[in-house]
């Protein structure tokens, strides 16, 4: 996945740091005090639709051999810059019942974008 | 996930039969002949972004309290209708040295849609 | 909802000529293979061959082959199997069948009685 | 040409678990589908790809390979279960097995 340099408008990845704090999460997320999220965003031109190498792949190549066919719905749906690879951070917080758990949690940080 | 039924047109599910004699693939893939891989369709809203339940939802929540109070760059930044769940499909099939092959294949059937 | 409507039972003599037919309806008749099955009396299910009614591809079994002859039309969604020359033998019902993940759909059968 | 042995019969108490067993080569370069047909019926997919189940179908039906061994398990047999079941060996063609009638005591 592209990380973007703000020379490309093809779908990469933009560094963004979270401030829980920001967000108002300071009040039931301990630590840390914010983390590189991350984000992605440009253009899915038809050429690269399907071709992110992403968790995706096989289905997105599928939808894009209709696609790059002008195959009905396929020519007018819109490919997206989505996160394909997501990864786990762990992090110190209030539960419900306000015990204080250490977990890792999933899908927290984008590391890798294509498009869908 | 909503499942399309010609009545909303808020992001969700859409059934869709692919048959690997039509995407030439079934010189590579000896069974099945095709799959439902469906795929996903529809608006997303502002107020249904990032709402989706989806495997994103962590990060994507996190991206939409940005969204939702105008934060640069993410007030412009588009929610996608994407799949969100997908699974995994059995395939038969001629490996690069023409050995016959039976694996699971991850990631081919989506079976829930949200928006990014 | 998925359907497979054969025509009727015939009665014929050897040596005579015969057609019978298979309708699809509730699916894409075009991106499923449909497959024949014969059933003598009393025995078990012979696979037949198979045919591709979106461009009419078609495969026999060696047992089959040279001996009866499948073929489709989309623009009618049927696809047909047929005898130049009847025989006592031919007596049975004959399947069609939709290959999904298997033969997921099958018709009614159609009962085929060669007597002189 | 390639050939798939059924028994010719199998019979369970009600209750009980059936197992059909369909004897062929290769199970690893092809997949094994399962048909039940009752009398005077068309048959019906009660199994694909070797252990899956089609919407619709009870779930003490399940389907299983070991070595040269496809096998179908009735687990909890009922009346209604008694028919004709066909194993399939599904690659570029098709081959049914003979047949093995399941008779419920």
């Known amino acids: 996945g592209l990380e973007c340099d703000g020379k490309v408008n093809i779908c990469c990845k933009k560094q963004f740091f979270v401030s829980f704090k920001d967000i108002g999460w300071n009040d039931w997320i301990i630590a840390p005090s914010g983390y590189h999220a991350n984000y992605c965003e440009g253009e899915c031109p038809s050429h690269i639709a399907g071709t992110s190498g992403s968790s995706l792949s096989f289905h997105s190549t599928v939808i894009n051999h209709y696609r790059m066919r002008g195959h009905s719905p396929f020519a007018n749906l819109k490919s997206c810059c989505i996160p394909t690879k997501l990864s786990t951070m762990s992090m110190l917080y209030f539960d419900d019942e306000y015990n204080i758990v250490k977990r890792d949690v999933p899908n927290m940080i984008v590391e890798e974008c294509g498009c869908s | 996930g909503l499942e399309c039924d010609g009545k909303v047109n808020i992001c969700c599910k859409k059934q869709f039969f692919v048959s690997f004699k039509d995407i030439g693939w079934n010189d590579w893939i000896i069974a099945p002949s095709g799959y439902h891989a469906n795929y996903c369709e529809g608006e997303c809203p502002s107020h249904i972004a990032g709402t989706s339940g989806s495997s994103l939802s962590f990060h994507s929540t996190v991206i939409n309290h940005y969204r939702m109070r105008g934060h640069s760059p993410f007030a412009n930044l588009k929610s996608c209708c994407i799949p969100t769940k997908l699974s995994t499909m059995s395939m038969l099939y001629f490996d690069d040295e023409y050995n016959i092959v039976k694996r699971d294949v991850p990631n081919m059937i989506v079976e829930e849609c949200g928006c990014s | 909802e998925v359907q497979l409507v054969q025509s009727g039972a015939e009665v014929k003599k050897p040596g005579e000529s015969l057609k019978i037919s298979c309708q699809g309806s509730g699916y894409s008749f075009t991106s499923y293979w449909i497959g024949w099955v014969r059933q003598m009396p009393g025995k078990g299910l012979e696979w037949m061959g198979i045919?591709?009614?979106?461009?009419?591809?078609?495969r026999y079994s060696p047992s089959f082959q040279g001996q009866v002859t499948i073929s489709a039309d989309k623009s009618i969604s049927t696809a047909y199997l047929q005898w130049s020359s009847l025989k006592a033998s031919d007596t049975a019902m004959y399947y069609c069948?939709?290959?999904?993940?298997?033969?997921?759909?099958w018709g009614q059968g159609t009962l085929v009685t060669v007597s002189s | 040409s390639y050939e798939l042995t059924q028994p010719p019969s199998v019979s369970v108490s009600p209750g009980q678990t059936a197992s059909i067993t369909c004897s062929g080569e290769k199970w690893g370069e092809k997949y094994a589908c399962w048909y039940q047909q009752k009398p005077g019926q068309s048959p019906v997919l009660v199994i694909y790809?070797?252990?899956k189940r089609p919407s619709g179908i009870p779930e003490r039906f399940s389907g299983s390979i070991s070595g040269n061994t496809a096998t179908l398990t009735i687990s909890g047999t009922q009346a209604m279960d008694e028919a004709d079941y066909y194993c399939q060996a599904w690659d570029r063609s098709t081959v049914f097995g003979g047949g093995t009638k399941l008779t419920v005591l």
């Open positions: 790809q070797d252990t």
């Open positions: 069948a939709r290959q999904g993940l298997g033969f997921d759909y």
């Open positions: 045919i591709y009614p979106g461009d009419s591809d078609t």
